[in-house]
Interface confidence: medium
């Protein structure tokens, strides 16, 4: 064997570790944990890389890794790995976290370019709850790779800190 | 559409070497991991080794262990299997066939002929 | 490795029969059980992959059911480009073995 498993190191990564189980699931298996932005393939017995499969239809394993980079390729979006969702930045300027920084403060130099809801929020008729870090705390939470709103899907100040720290 | 277009047969002798290559086309040939799986006479079929798709990591079957080498040319879009210390027992179909990431092999190569023979 | 099992290894049958080819696993493989068709000089073609998710392409008289370690393969009306040899694969786990094959030939 060459060039395999040499990248393998300890610890679980934030991409999901993933192994068939008889029953077809997917499973983690701690000792078999992968650097990060990789998953362990029974069949092949190595560590896969997941950008490899991220234009394949059946990427399973790499799921949330492959949402993340297809979000961050979108511009004016990131992904929010609790949320598990891709976010749109245009739906939160004025309360935003730092990932949207660049996008909302070039948005706002343009109130042109603002749709109706936040050209009022910058003119102060809708509450403003970003602290002075910038980070997003109280408002509705929209945006996601399928449809642009996840209506209704409100987080506690708490849960936003942990996003966002 | 993709295809696997593999070189023609070989006539060796036994301690030679021989090498098969496998053509991709129709597809990102880096996408993908591209296998071995050899066919002896009257026998099953029997897996040899893969290559990895984004750099040379390679992974052999312990029984070729030593004696199989699988490469790749990613301009070329193809694979090269070279077996060597060639014996009588090594007279088979050899395949390169495309790994789905799903547990199977959605392509194969149309087969390379090898005869060992003194 | 895991070893696996097929029968009958040949099996004479008439165009429009229904026919039944099995597979067995050494252990349990849950549903990552694969079915190959060869025709001598062709290239060998996958048929059906997790025990009965039809490849493209492939006919649907093709069916595949079964699960842990006991699978078949069946053609509900053999018709005359059937007759080949079928191999079945596990890609349950490293590394990937096949059955010994069942060769269908016209009765």
């Known amino acids: 064997m060459s060039g395999l498993g040499r990248s393998r190191r300890g610890g679980r990564s934030r991409v999901d570790q993933e192994e068939r189980s008889p029953q077809g699931l997917w499973t983690g298996v701690a000792m078999r944990s992968c650097p990060e932005e990789q998953y362990w393939d029974p069949l092949l017995g190595t560590c896969m890389s997941c950008k490899a499969i991220c234009n394949h239809q059946s990427q399973r394993t790499c799921a949330t890794f492959c949402r993340s980079l297809n979000c961050r390729k979108e511009q004016g979006r990131f992904y929010d790995h609790l949320l598990r969702d891709c976010i749109s930045c245009a739906s939160i300027c004025g309360q935003h976290p730092k990932q949207c920084a660049y996008f909302c403060e070039n948005k706002l130099r343009s109130p042109v370019n603002l749709p109706p809801e936040l050209r009022r929020q910058r003119s102060g008729e809708v509450e403003n709850n970003s602290d002075n870090s910038g980070r997003y705390q109280g408002s509705e939470h929209r945006g996601s790779e399928a449809s642009p709103a996840l209506p209704g899907l409100k987080l506690s100040a708490d849960q936003l800190a942990l996003v966002y720290s | 559409q993709v295809q696997l277009v593999q070189s023609g047969a070989e006539v060796k002798k036994p301690g030679a070497s021989v090498k098969v290559s496998c053509k991709a086309s129709?597809?990102?040939?880096?996408?993908?991991?591209m296998h071995w799986v050899r066919q002896a006479p009257g026998q099953r079929l029997e897996w040899m080794g893969y290559?990895?798709?984004?750099?040379?990591?390679?992974k052999y079957s312990q029984k070729f262990q030593g004696r199989v080498t699988i490469t790749r040319d990613t301009s070329a879009s193809t694979a090269y299997m070279e077996l060597s210390s060639l014996r009588s027992e090594d007279t088979a179909v050899y395949y390169c066939?495309?790994?789905?990431?799903?547990?199977?092999?959605?392509?194969w190569g149309q087969g390379t002929t090898v005869t060992v023979s003194s | 490795d895991i070893q696996m099992t097929q029968s009958p290894s040949s099996l004479s049958a008439s165009v429009g029969d229904r026919v039944t080819i099995t597979c067995r696993a050494s252990?349990?493989?849950?549903?990552?059980l694969n079915w190959y068709q060869q025709k001598p000089g062709k290239a060998v073609k996958l048929l059906m992959r997790?025990?009965?998710r039809l490849h493209s392409g492939v006919p649907s008289r093709f069916s595949g059911s079964g699960s842990g370690t006991d699978f078949t393969l069946t053609i509900s009306s053999l018709q005359p480009e059937d007759f080949a040899t079928y191999y079945c694969?596990?890609?349950?786990?490293?590394?990937?073995?096949f059955g010994g094959g069942t060769k269908l030939e016209i009765k």
């Open positions: 066939a495309r790994y789905d990431w799903e547990g199977s092999f959605d392509y």
């Open positions: 129709g597809y990102t040939f880096t996408n993908y991991v």
């Open positions: 290559i990895l798709p984004y750099n040379d990591g390679t």
């Open positions: 252990q349990d493989i849950g549903n990552y």
């Open positions: 997790y025990t009965s």
């Open positions: 694969q596990q890609g349950f786990t490293f590394p990937p073995t």
